[in-house]
């Protein structure tokens, strides 16, 4: 039985040209994490393994960092990268869990709005 | 003056499928999500899912995956969203209302259509 | 998915009251930046529904300023310092920091 739960940073609205950190975590339960994968929509952005670390997809590696911990950077951020992004943890032995993280990003100059963005 | 204009009432058939269409104007189109909302009974809403369609990017409420396909087509300023194998259970009123850039809020809405499923 | 709660489920009104309408959520609404993407929507009989309140206390466009919004976390709150006709309707907190964006049950501000 899949006990897990998900808990990720939420939403983001960020600024074009910036970066944001996409973060999950999973509690309560003591399956062993084997790798997680992030993707967005469906494309693979990167995964990391628990015995081979990290991959970076070739398209992405520019943009993309690994970390901090099972997160992912994302940087100099386009308005193109606006989408959902997908944390799946793969486990044993519970299976699959998957967090869902929404990004939205921004023309700089809506930020005369009043929108806090966050721009690490 | 930003307007959301959506297409009339339907009466449909259980196990029928439907679309829904959503014409914007008045702002940049592309720039803004688009999302649709659900409400039963004449009270409870429900978030079904969003498009952006800059880059056609969607998110769904994992409860409408099957049911509900979200599209758009830039050069008219449409989205629509599509309801799939109707039930009596779909009966409702469905919005479209477009994204408050920086605050995932609701910030204008359509009229709303009627949606009816009924043999 | 986050349980949006609101209460009272009905709130019986005179004109000139000040009221409070709280939404609870099940998990906190702060994103790992610090903002928090909770609104209220008013939804009047025969309209569609509008926005009120954004990002917990910004009032949108048009909005009068007897409305009014706080809170933090998992306790948010809107309040109406002077009851008017127009205010009657259908009240609804939303979310949209966690996917699924997900509604309160809505709240009944009626007439005494």
């Known amino acids: 039985m899949m006990t897990g739960t998900i808990e990720t940073t939420g939403n983001i609205s960020a600024e074009k040209g910036g970066s944001i950190i996409l973060q999950c975590h999973l509690s309560s339960t003591t399956a062993q994490v084997t790798q997680v994968n992030w993707e967005q929509q469906d494309q693979l952005l990167a995964i990391c393994n628990a015995d081979l670390g990290w991959h970076i997809s070739p398209s992405f590696k520019d943009r993309v960092a690994p970390g901090p911990g099972l997160g992912l950077t994302l940087q100099s951020l386009t308005v193109n990268d606006t989408g959902e992004y997908f944390c799946i943890y793969h486990t044993y032995p519970d299976g699959t869990y998957t967090g869902r993280i929404f990004l939205e990003v921004l023309e700089s100059s809506v930020a005369e709005h009043g929108a806090r963005f966050q721009i690490p | 003056e930003v307007q959301l204009q959506q297409s009339g009432p339907e009466m449909v058939k259980p196990g029928a499928s439907m679309k829904i269409s959503c014409k914007a104007s008045g702002y940049s189109f592309t720039g803004y999500t688009m999302n649709w909302v659900k409400q039963s009974h004449g009270k409870n809403l429900e978030w079904l899912g969003l498009?952006?369609?800059?880059?056609?990017?969607?998110s769904y409420n994992q409860k409408f995956t099957g049911k509900a396909t979200i599209t758009v087509d830039k050069s008219s300023n449409t989205t629509y969203m599509e309801l799939l194998s109707l039930t009596s259970e779909d009966s409702a009123v469905y919005y479209c209302?477009?994204?408050?850039?920086?605050?995932?809020?609701?910030?204008?809405w359509g009229q709303g259509t009627s949606v009816t499923v009924s043999s | 998915d986050v349980v949006m709660t609101q209460t009272p489920l009905s709130l019986p009104v005179s004109f000139g009251d000040q009221v409070s309408i709280s939404c609870r959520s099940s998990q906190s609404l702060a994103n790992s930046y610090g903002n928090t993407y909770l609104s209220w929507y008013l939804h009047k009989p025969g309209q569609s529904p509008h926005l009120l309140i954004y990002g917990i206390s910004n009032r949108f466009s048009g909005v009068p300023d007897r409305f009014s919004g706080s809170g933090s976390g998992t306790d948010f709150t809107l309040k109406i310092s002077t009851i008017k006709p127009e205010d009657l309707g259908m009240y609804y907190c939303?979310?949209?920091?966690?996917?699924?964006?997900?509604f309160g049950g809505g709240t009944k501000l009626e007439i005494r």
């Open positions: 498009i952006f369609p800059y880059n056609s990017a969607t």
């Open positions: 939303l979310q949209g920091t966690h996917q699924p964006w997900t």
């Open positions: 209302a477009r994204g408050l850039r920086g605050f995932f809020a609701l910030d204008y």
